[in-house]
């Protein structure tokens, strides 16, 4: 189970993980105390038949070719959490692990 | 965490789970002993901003809008295994649980 890593200038056409730094301050998300920025990454690229397919199911749907199935797309296949300090809706400061905030691997599903 | 369920006649445009029965015999996959057919389901539909987004990360990437990011797509967000009886490459009969063979829920990621 592997995935490609690319940089933002790469001409790679296949499904790949690209670097992306999310800046909460730039978004105006002032309820987030820390971190102000973090490396989130994102997935982009084409999912040609079979390349980087995460599940056998993806292959089976392609073979069955039901109406409306758009083929696999490039999406996170492994994600990890980050620890965050933030205000909740009641203006209380919360420290917690927020799941699925960082893309570790991309694939076709 | 929920997902829409549709049938094959539905006019729903959003990301939805549709029924699909995979027929191994019809595919000519004669190394599979049992089951000969199973309900696999598949995901199809549009991922308008925010609808059925599985991760906060999806929202953040949309907001950052990096070059080449194609927006979220409709993909399995929960899958389950099935038990299968099949011949492996050495012609041995194997009984095992094959992961991610059934789509239980669809979402946008």
């Amino acid at each position: 189970d592997f995935g490609l890593d690319c940089d933002e200038h790469s001409t790679e056409s296949r499904c790949c993980r690209y670097p992306l730094t999310v800046d909460f301050e730039a978004f105006g998300w002032d309820w987030i105390i820390a971190p102000k920025r973090y490396k989130a990454n994102y997935c982009s690229g084409e999912c040609e038949f079979v390349f980087l397919q995460k599940y056998p199911h993806t292959h089976l749907v392609h073979q069955a070719n039901p109406r409306g199935s758009a083929g696999p797309c490039c999406t996170p296949t492994k994600m990890s959490p980050i620890n965050m300090l933030y205000f909740n809706g009641k203006e209380q400061i919360i420290y917690g692990k927020i799941p699925a905030m960082v893309v570790d691997r991309c694939g076709c599903s | 965490d929920f997902g829409l369920d549709c049938d094959e006649h539905s006019t729903e445009s959003r990301c939805c789970r549709y029924p699909l029965t995979v027929d191994f015999e019809a595919f000519g996959w004669d190394w599979i002993i049992a089951p000969k057919r199973y309900k696999a389901n598949y995901c199809s539909g549009e991922c308008e901003f925010v609808f059925l987004q599985k991760y906060p990360h999806t929202h953040l990437v949309h907001q950052a809008n990096p070059r080449g990011s194609a927006g979220p797509c409709c993909t399995p967000t929960k899958m389950s295994p099935i038990n299968m009886l099949y011949f492996n490459g050495k012609e041995q009969i194997i009984y095992g649980k094959i992961p991610a063979m059934v789509v239980d829920r669809c979402g946008c990621s």
Epitope: S10, T11, E12, S13, R14, S44, G45, E46 | G68, A70
Partner: antibody
């Protein structure tokens, strides 16, 4: 035989718009990324834009970003370049070029059209 | 942006002789380099891709080599139809960039 035929060029004034077309034949159009490359009179080649086979991925040169829009109609085997806010420096022969798919990188052109001349002048 | 620099700008060669054209990238482009040939009033034509692979229908007298940042195109025993402008082009990074061209003219 692969054929690419550009059309839509002509003389326009600065600030005006023009839409170029490239009619493709001889290959499965939807399976290949397509490109526009231009050449100013007496000058070298300059890449303008690339669009993936599905149309889902699009890339532009900084010099045209925000003014030019690449698109494709796979049902008509046609590539387009909508050029707005044209400037004198956009004067060039515009070639459409097919991506080769010799490897997984965009931008390797194996067939080129003959080009269409765009002149921007007052 | 990766800058592609070709040298010489003009190369004067007699028919039947060998011509060697140089192309240098300002940063590593791996093997994602192509060579195109263009005659006056015509469209470019792909000669070489992936640094050294000849495109379909390209004669064996054309060969190319290099890696990373330094590349070369060699034309053995120049024929009359080989007198043209040659462009190198990298397709490793956006934006795609071409060299300024080398004009191969009859000596």
């Amino acid at each position: 035989e692969v054929q690419l035929l550009e059309s839509g060029g002509g003389l326009v004034q600065p600030g005006e718009s023009l839409r170029l077309s490239c009619a493709a034949s001889g290959f499965t159009f939807s399976s290949y990324a397509m490109n526009w490359v231009r050449q100013a009179p007496g000058k070298g080649l300059e890449w303008v834009s690339t669009i993936s086979g599905s149309g889902g991925y699009i890339y532009y040169a900084d010099s045209v970003k925000g003014r030019f829009t690449i698109s494709r109609d796979n049902s008509k085997n046609t590539l387009y370049l909508q050029m707005n806010s044209l400037r004198a420096e956009d004067t060039a022969v515009y070639f459409c070029a097919k991506d080769s798919r010799y490897n997984w990188n965009y931008g390797n052109f194996d067939y080129w059209g003959q080009g269409t001349l765009v002149t921007v002048s007052s | 942006e990766i800058v592609m620099t070709q040298s010489p700008a003009t190369l004067s060669v007699s028919p039947g002789e060998r011509a060697t054209l140089s192309c240098r990238a300002s940063q590593n482009v791996s093997s994602n380099l192509a060579w195109n040939k263009q005659k006056p009033g015509q469209a470019p034509r792909l000669l070489i891709y992936a640094t050294s692979t000849r495109a379909t229908g390209v004669p064996a007298r054309f060969s190319a080599s290099g890696s990373g940042t330094d590349f070369a195109l060699t034309i053995n025993s120049l024929q009359s139809e080989d007198f043209a402008v040659y462009y190198c082009q990298q397709y490793n990074n956006w934006p795609l960039t071409f060299g300024g061209g080398t004009k191969v003219e009859i000596k």
